[in-house]
């Protein structure tokens, strides 16, 4: 079991970990389709991590700790895009993760949202391992971009995030 998140450190008693769900405008797109803006949330914050020099034999207490600000609860919703000029596929559904709540959680841990898990293999086909992060893209940082080489209709895709609402 992962160690519980740390909110305070003895060395820095005046500092507290924080992790918030910030409102963003997410642009959902797909090649050949009209992009759509939706309201979503991004996890943003500063959670504690530390590394203490090791010993041999190793002491029983954990010497390395890492928390990350990630979704505590999210759900997956369909966003339908119109694709003018595509007779065979006039509309495409994309699944978008809607983040409800965020919290500091162990870095190696799968985010504790109870929704659908998404694993993305590389373009080089089966056999390539999904990354340690159990999402197709890192959780967005305001102003950042998370493009994808080939845009699957089901992949949550944040082309750009707007300022906090």
């Amino acid at each position: 079991a992962a160690p519980p998140p740390i909110n305070k450190l003895a060395l820095f008693p005046d500092k507290s970990a924080w992790c918030e769900a910030k409102n963003i405008t997410q642009i959902v797109g797909h090649s050949g389709c009209e992009a759509k803006s939706i309201q979503n949330r991004a996890c943003l914050g500063q959670c504690f991590s530390y590394s203490v020099p090791n010993t041999f034999p190793q002491s029983t207490e954990s010497l390395v700790h890492c928390d990350s600000c990630m979704p505590a609860q999210s759900m997956w919703e369909i966003v339908t895009l119109e694709c003018p000029g595509h007779e065979e596929v006039p509309r495409v559904d994309k699944l978008v993760e809607k983040i409800l709540h965020c919290s500091c959680q162990a870095c190696g841990k799968e985010p504790s949202h109870e929704g659908l898990s998404v694993y993305v293999q590389g373009e080089d086909g089966p056999g390539s391992q999904p990354g340690t992060h159990p999402h197709p893209h890192p959780h967005p940082h305001p102003g950042g971009q998370t493009p994808e080489p080939e845009d699957p209709p089901g992949a949550p895709h944040t082309e750009e995030e707007g300022a906090e609402d």
Partner: antibody, heavy 120, light 111 residues
């Protein structure tokens, strides 16, 4: 018209891994715009969605099965596959592969299905 | 137990009309399109309607779908013996345990 055909062992022992392959003909998995799905039906029961894969390798799994499910794709063979680990008798079912349209709620084409029995 | 609720069975005489209900919630039917599938004995399911009320080519207009609020309905008019089958509704569920969900199925018997 696209056709899908499931293949794999009809009998799997408990605790082993169930492996099935779906071969797609009459269309290319790589054409985009479609999800390729696995769905199962327990004997005399309703339908249960297992998961999707897109030709790029992106996968979406049923939360209740995700710890045991792996879906992969081989575009060169126009096939996608299902692996279900640690099977029990409760995994005995007819397994269907299917093509889900660009509309997620529309499963347009189905394979004929293959019965997999879990028994020692 | 299925996320979507259907009656286990309905029956009618040839030429009559039957309706099959599919009840859900705001996280599934209420906010997403519904499809209906027909499964004849010993065969794979077949898409009957999609996007609530559209029919794929080759599906006769005796089959019609509709949706209101958190419920959907499949209607079959001019019932034929060949319509005796199991019928399933399906949609996306965006609750915390998100995924593609189906009803438990309804057996249609032609008397």
């Amino acid at each position: 018209e696209v056709q899908l055909l499931e293949s794999g062992p009809g009998l799997v022992k408990p605790s082993q891994t169930l492996s099935l392959t779906c071969t797609v003909s009459g269309g290319s998995i790589s054409s985009g715009g479609y999800y390729w799905s696995w769905i199962r039906q327990h004997p005399g029961k309703g339908l249960e969605w297992i998961g999707y894969i897109y030709y790029s390798g992106s996968t979406y799994y049923n939360p209740s099965l995700k710890s045991r499910v792996t879906i992969s794709v081989d575009t060169s063979k126009n096939q996608f596959s299902l692996k279900l680990s640690s099977v029990t008798a409760a995994d005995t079912a007819v397994y269907y592969c299917a093509r889900t349209n660009s509309r997620i709620t529309m499963i347009a084409d189905w394979g004929q299905g293959t019965l997999v029995t879990v028994s020692s | 137990q299925s996320v979507l609720t259907q009656p286990p069975s309905v029956s009618a005489a040839p030429g009559q009309k039957v309706t099959i209900s599919c009840s859900g919630s705001s996280s599934n039917i209420g906010n997403n399109y519904v499809s209906w599938y027909q499964q004849l004995p010993g065969t794979a399911p077949k898409l009957l309607t999609y996007d609530n009320n559209k029919r794929p080519s080759g599906i006769p207009d005796r089959f019609s779908g509709s949706k209101s609020g958190t419920s959907a309905t499949l209607g079959i008019t001019g019932l034929q013996t060949g319509d005796e089958a199991d019928y399933y509704c399906g949609t996306w569920d965006s609750s915390l345990s998100a995924g593609h969900v189906f009803g438990g199925g309804t057996k249609v018997t032609v008397l």
